[in-house]
């Protein structure tokens, strides 16, 4: 018998290796796993990061490294321990033969091993013609606070610290971890070596062309004169920052990573640890005209990942490539022909393009926001960056069709005032990775640790899905979407909000199996409905029109198909009030939307009824979008009728608190 799924098999393997950078990996934590870069030319075999289990002490790391050396020597292999990690991740960097991997994976405390790989500066081209320094009129860009309370760390090339733009603003640390330049005929030329870092330092905090003119910077050299570095060098740089932070705690820290390599589990893990230590990390999405989730650190959820747009709000094209896109991008920022300090001379300027420049803009904006509100958490900062962005200005036609819905249509902007945003209920939409096409495949979307999951929806391009539900995982609610048999896979879409002192729970009603449909409401006193989800065990959900969508006087109620279980997200928070807003269209239509009014924030987005011709629902900024199958493929008019259901909330408590501050 032929294997009917042969093509699918190849596709899954290709996607897996790119998404996870994964070699063979047992799943239940019994054995350590080995990972390597999915981009072959970027691999650096012979150097490996051995990551140890979370609670491993430095002495155990050193002992494990020595044990590896001893066991390798007994087999006739030479090894060299290049670095022992501690402070961020426990582990060590070792130079050894790949033959020893099997042995190394069996060592005590080993969590996983990753082969080292290259990372690259994300700017193109490096030197265009020089331009004279632009003169600013007094009424031009003069921000109220230049980020003076914030320190920005730049992990990049060496820099020309005596450039007039950045002189006295950038402290060059003694940190350097770079690979040898390629090619025997390479001549180091200071101006070339300093080009990328100098330009970015200028974009962040330059006197004339900088975003946060008051921010002080520290530079670490992790990229060589060709703009190339390694994952291991970047890791050691991040560890250096963490140790500096512990030795001498200062105000808010922003770390700018204007570089990208292939997906790296270890680099993402290090970024996560640093972010959880209170550091804001900003990175380039990458210049590969590709899904940013396939690159690191762009794919790390804790990092603010920035794509590049031009003056016309078009995604930036860079030669045959261009800005990365997709669900791992948080927002876009200017990244084409950006004028900044040139390392050719101390008063020279140059224009450079790329997601590095875009990330530098966001690092500057972040520095200013943090200077105005030093207590902002990473989650609060990210939500503010999204909230103050210009919405729906990017021409999405540039992105591949399947990525358009996943890519945020947001261009970073400075807040109109650095104070006074505290009253707002901030929410953002988080898309999961694609589930894959098997019947039992699920996709999970998660909010950041200090965000609340207020609603959960799902989306499938084929329309074959079994809905979604909110469930507890590790003490936190997550959004899980379910694929259906013969489907192409699903996405889970979480609505993640900042809601201080919130107490949220999920109330579920099993399938009603009656013609009335399934209903569930928030019955606890003081709890309001923030989102509705529905999930069904049947593969084909028959058509069903609830006779009444929502009885009057029952705003706190979710309704759905009689064969589905319905889940209501019910929250109690000081001053929280919510209302349900519906927009129904009697005739078939591919897209139905409903938006929340000014002053209200969209927390929930769902579709009625949940029948199989509905592809799903998702929030775009403050609008709930319900997508249905192509009108021509939909059956009767009655089956095509769809209602978009938005739940709009606001917090009177936040508003009052903000007024009291003023």
């Amino acid at each position: 018998q032929e294997d009917e799924d042969g093509d699918y098999e190849e596709l899954v393997l290709a996607l897996r290796s790119e998404e996870d950078g994964l070699a063979e990996a047992p799943e239940h934590g019994t054995t350590a796993t080995f990972h390597r870069c999915a981009k072959d030319p970027w691999r650096l075999p012979g150097t490996y990061v051995v990551v140890l289990k979370e609670e491993t002490h430095l002495s155990q790391s050193e002992r494990t490294a020595r044990r590896l050396q001893a066991q390798a020597a007994r087999r006739g292999y030479l090894t060299k321990i290049l670095h022992v990690f501690h402070g961020l991740l426990p582990g060590f960097l070792v130079k050894m033969s790949g033959d020893l991997l099997e042995l190394a994976l069996k060592l005590p405390h080993v969590d996983y091993i990753e082969e080292d790989s290259s990372v690259f500066a994300q700017s193109i081209p490096w030197n265009l013609e020089r331009i004279t320094p632009p003169r600013y009129r007094a009424d031009e860009y003069q921000p109220p606070d230049g980020g003076s309370l914030v320190e920005v760390y730049l992990l990049d090339t060496s820099i020309q610290s005596d450039h007039r733009e950045i002189e006295g603003r950038v402290m060059v640390t003694d940190f350097e971890n770079v690979p040898e330049e390629d090619g025997t005929r390479f001549h180091r030329q200071a101006s070339k070596c300093d080009s990328h870092g100098t330009h970015l330092a200028g974009v962040v905090s330059g006197r004339d062309a900088g975003v946060a003119k008051g921010a002080s910077m520290r530079s670490l050299r992790v990229l060589n004169c060709q703009g190339k570095g390694t994952v291991s060098g970047t890791l050691i740089g991040l560890e250096f920052i963490r140790k500096s932070q512990l030795v001498q705690p200062v105000g808010p820290l922003v770390v700018l990573l204007p570089l990208a390599g292939g997906y790296s589990r270890v680099l993402n893990a290090a970024c996560q640890r640093l972010a959880r230590a209170g550091v804001v990390l900003v990175t380039a999405a990458g210049n590969f005209r590709d899904d940013a989730c396939l690159y690191s650190p762009a794919s790390a959820p804790e990092v603010i990942t920035v794509g590049a747009t031009n003056a016309q709000d078009q995604p930036v094209t860079l030669g045959t490539l261009g800005t990365n896109f997709g669900r791992c991008v948080d927002l876009f920022a200017p990244g084409e022909d950006i004028i900044g300090a040139s390392s050719d001379c101390s008063t020279c300027f140059v224009s450079q393009s790329g997601t590095s420049q875009a990330a530098a803009h966001v690092a500057g904006i972040a520095a200013m926001m943090l200077s105005a509100e030093p207590e902002l958490t990473l989650a609060e900062l990210r939500q503010r960056l999204i909230h103050f962005s210009a919405k729906d200005v990017i021409n999405e036609a540039w992105f591949p069709e399947d990525q358009r819905v996943l890519t945020p249509n947001l261009v970073a902007a400075l807040p109109p005032s650095t104070h006074g945003a505290g009253w707002q209920l901030f929410c953002r939409t988080v898309w999961s990775a694609h589930s894959g096409p098997t019947r039992m495949a699920t996709a999970v979307a998660r909010c950041a640790p200090d965000e609340e999951l207020l609603s959960c929806s799902s989306f499938s391009r084929s329309g074959k899905r079994r809905g979604e539900r909110m469930e507890a995982q590790g003490g936190k609610l997550v959004c899980r979407a379910h694929n259906a048999f013969g489907g192409e896979g699903v996405y889970a879409i979480a609505r993640c909000c900042l809601l201080p002192q919130a107490n949220c729970s999920v109330h579920t009603a099993p399938p009603a199996e009656a013609s009335m449909g399934t209903r569930v409401h928030c019955h606890q006193q003081g709890h309001v409905l923030t989102g509705c989800s529905s999930h069904w065990e049947v593969e084909d959900l028959g058509t069903h029109k609830p006779p009444v969508l929502r009885p009057r006087g029952q705003p706190n109620q979710c309704v759905g198909h009689r064969e589905a279980s319905i889940h209501a997200s019910c929250c109690h928070a000081p001053g929280l009030e919510c209302k349900v807003k519906e927009h129904g269209i009697p005739a078939p239509q591919e897209q139905v939307t409903v938006a929340c009014e000014e002053g209200w924030t969209l927390t929930g987005c769902s579709a009625l009824p949940g029948t199989s011709h509905v592809l799903g629902a998702y929030a775009v900024d403050n609008t709930c979008v319900v997508r249905s199958r192509d009108v021509s493929t939909t059956g009767s008019t009655s089956e095509g009728a769809v209602t978009a259901v938005a739940i709009c909330c606001r917090s009177r408590h936040l508003a009052q608190a903000s007024q009291e501050l003023q």
Partner: antibody, heavy 117, light 108 residues
């Protein structure tokens, strides 16, 4: 060529334990939903358990809490850990692969589990 | 749980004749029904899925029809290798995935 090979069956006393293995070749097991189906002598087929490509697990009511399904991607194998075995669990146990657009497209040859005192 | 019933329990047919096997679901399962053939000492073999689609390598004499709750497997002209037990299975509502009790097709 796609192949599934079960092992681990045998004779066990009531209350005892067994671990069935299903080794896959010709495809990557963790890319598919994999199932265990059993058949008592002279009887029909009964679905027992499944593990999804994303790791979710499912069981029939009569084995819930007694049987555990798992997989090892490195070995391209999946398992059925059977505890507190009962006489009624006596059957030939088959592992089967569920296709993307087809139900059970490949089956193993089966392994006999006998629970008897 | 959806209960699948098959009729008849045994069907005696002469080679070359037509065989019609029935399967009924206790509630609608759309078109998510499969048919399997099992010979003594062997594992089942997928014949039909989606109620009417033949699996790879299955001869054209096997055909399936039906949707909702009533399904039929037809073998247009029985060959000697077709004498076996045939099971229907629903995979619309799960877990569990449920099979019918089987129909034994033997030589008349």
């Amino acid at each position: 060529e796609v192949q599934l090979v079960e092992s681990g069956g045998g004779l066990v006393q009531p209350g005892g334990s067994l671990r069935l293995s299903c080794a896959a070749s010709g495809f990557t097991l963790s890319s598919y939903d994999m199932h265990w189906v059993r058949q008592a002598t002279g009887k029909g087929l009964e679905w027992v358990s499944a593990i999804g490509s994303t790791g979710d697990t499912y069981y029939t009511g009569s084995v819930m809490g007694r049987f555990t399904i798992s997989r090892d991607a490195a070995k391209n194998s999946f398992y059925l850990e059977m505890n507190s075995l009962r006489v009624g669990d006596t059957a030939v146990y088959y592992c089967a692969r569920e296709g993307i657009r087809t139900p059970y497209d490949y089956w193993g040859q089966g392994t006999l589990v006998t629970v008897s005192s | 749980e959806i209960v699948m019933t098959q009729s008849p329990a045994t069907l005696s047919v002469s080679p070359g004749e037509r065989a019609t096997l029935s399967c009924r679901a206790s509630q609608s399962v759309s078109s998510n029904v499969a048919w399997y053939q099992q010979k003594p000492g062997q594992a089942p073999r997928l014949l039909i899925y989606g109620a009417s689609t033949r699996a790879t390598g299955i001869p054209a004499r096997f055909s399936g029809s039906g949707s909702g709750t009533e399904f039929t497997l037809t073998i247009s002209s029985l060959q000697s290798e077709d004498f076996a037990v045939y099971y229907c299975q629903q995979y619309n509502n799960w877990p569990p995935f449920t099979f019918g009790p089987g129909t034994k097709v033997d030589i008349k």
